[in-house]
């Protein structure tokens, strides 16, 4: 036969046993809680870094681009790529023609003002999107020249210029005085490439790499 | 040796027309751009127009556009400045100038001796 | 248009002694390095020489008395020492755009 335990004694053990619950169940709430605020403060914090950043790139631009446009890439909500807005964009470059007619060194110093360089075309499909945005009776600045007069063409970006990637118009280059590249249209070609000297105000071209935030 | 040598310079009545023609020897002609600059008397100079060696291109300052037409014959080794509607203002000294290209600019590294306009009713 | 302001507009200096004159563009003439600014003599009755091209780079058949020097807009030609021939009007121009530009002239006279 068990004894019967006292009331005093099952008192104590009761409270021992309830004490034990609250404990597990204060610390379980505790530990969730700990989880909890881990859970949404660590994603709070990735996020808020990451406006900071993008805020802080954007103030970079501002000065001489107040208005971006900014498109998402891709299917993450969290990479935009942005042009400022009066600009074209296309693949990862950005695109901006110039009226105001001016000799080839102003004209790359404005684009470089502006975060761009004179044009640099690399591809066919490139200059084919260039062209949608110009006007046939105008010329317009790449960022092309030969300012020794050797025929030794150069990229302002330090693109290797390549032979076999230029989209000059039949017989030009033609003179060795004539040490900037222009595109214009020749109803007979289309759009093309010519030589003209450096010193002659004409329109241009500047492109950036697109801003991505 | 390189020559400019400058002729057709003269008294014309204001509205009236002058050519001016520049001879160039020493030098082949034909590869090099040509200018015109004029000093009026006791004045600094003044650029009046440009050739390119091509002869794709001319430009002219605003004072002289649409009455001004520089032209050059190659074959000839010769320059030409066609001068209409003169005006008091356009009297001066004028300079038949070769132009050395140089970076992405020029400057004129031989000059003629000068013929004199003088434009006065 | 670019507009070359000189100074001063005369000077007298003694045989011996140096010449400096000083040519301001409205705006920059320099373009990586290269500094489209060039330097004239012109004695009188005769038309204008040729003396320094591109800022610094002296004409061949012109005197090492002759130096030129500056970037951006500030340039300018030293004659040291000054000789007696040198008495003329100095000039400056710009060739970095279109029109081209010259400075008013500075009349140098050896005293």
């Known amino acids: 036969m068990v004894p019967e335990e006292e009331p005093q004694d099952r008192e104590k053990g009761l409270w021992w046993f309830q004490l034990k619950v609250w404990s597990m169940a204060v610390v379980s709430i505790l530990l969730l809680s700990v989880c909890f605020t881990v859970s949404s403060v660590v994603p709070h914090n990735f996020m808020y870094s990451k406006t900071v950043k993008r805020l802080s790139k954007l103030r970079e631009y501002q000065q001489y681009h107040p208005s971006l446009t900014c498109v998402m890439e891709g299917k993450d909500i969290e990479d935009w790529s942005c042009c400022p807005t009066p600009w074209t964009s296309f693949q990862s470059s950005c695109y901006f023609i110039s009226t105001g007619m001016q000799s080839w060194t102003k004209s790359q110093k404005n684009c470089s003002v502006m975060g761009a360089d004179l044009v640099v075309i690399n591809t066919r499909e490139e200059q084919d999107f260039i062209i949608q945005n110009l006007k046939r009776n105008s010329s317009y600045f790449l960022g092309l020249s030969d300012p020794g007069g050797r025929r030794h063409w150069q990229w302002v970006d330090q693109t290797p210029y390549n032979e076999n990637v230029t989209f000059w118009h039949s017989g030009e280059p033609n003179n060795l005085d004539e040490r900037c590249a222009i595109i214009n249209f020749r109803s007979s070609e289309e759009w093309g490439w010519n030589d003209i000297h450096c010193h002659v105000p004409q329109k241009s071209i500047c492109k950036m790499k697109k801003i991505y935030i | 040796e390189v020559q400019l040598v400058e002729s057709g310079g003269g008294l014309v009545k204001p509205g009236g027309s002058l050519r001016l023609s520049c001879a160039a020897s020493?030098?082949?002609?034909?590869?090099?751009?040509m200018s015109w600059v004029r000093q009026a008397p006791g004045k600094g100079l003044e650029w009046v127009a440009t050739?390119?060696?091509?002869?794709?291109?001319?430009y002219y300052p605003d004072s002289v556009k649409g009455r001004f037409t520089i032209s050059r014959d190659n074959a000839k080794n010769s320059l030409y400045l066609q001068m209409n509607s003169l005006r008091a203002e356009d009297t001066a000294v004028y300079y038949c100038?070769?132009?050395?290209?140089?970076?992405?600019?020029?400057?004129?590294?031989?000059w003629g001796q000068g013929t004199t306009v003088t434009v006065s009713s | 248009d670019i507009v070359l302001t000189q100074s001063p507009a005369s000077l007298a200096v003694s045989p011996g002694q140096r010449a400096t004159i000083t040519c301001r563009a409205s705006e920059s003439v320099s373009f990586h390095g290269t500094h489209l600014m060039h330097w004239y003599q012109q004695k009188p009755g005769q038309p204008p020489k040729l003396l320094i091209y591109a800022a610094s780079n002296l004409e061949s058949g012109v005197p090492a008395r002759f130096s030129g020097s500056g970037s951006e807009t500030d340039f300018t030609l030293t004659i040291n020492p000054v000789e007696a021939e040198d008495t003329a009007n100095y000039y400056c121009?710009?060739?970095?755009?279109?029109?081209?530009?010259f400075g008013g002239g500075t009349k140098v006279e050896i005293k």
């Open positions: 100038a070769r132009q050395l290209y140089y970076s992405y600019g020029y400057y004129f590294d031989y």
């Open positions: 020493g030098f082949t002609f034909s590869s090099y751009g």
């Open positions: 121009q710009q060739s970095i755009e279109d029109p081209p530009t």
């Open positions: 050739i390119s060696s091509g002869d794709s291109y001319t």
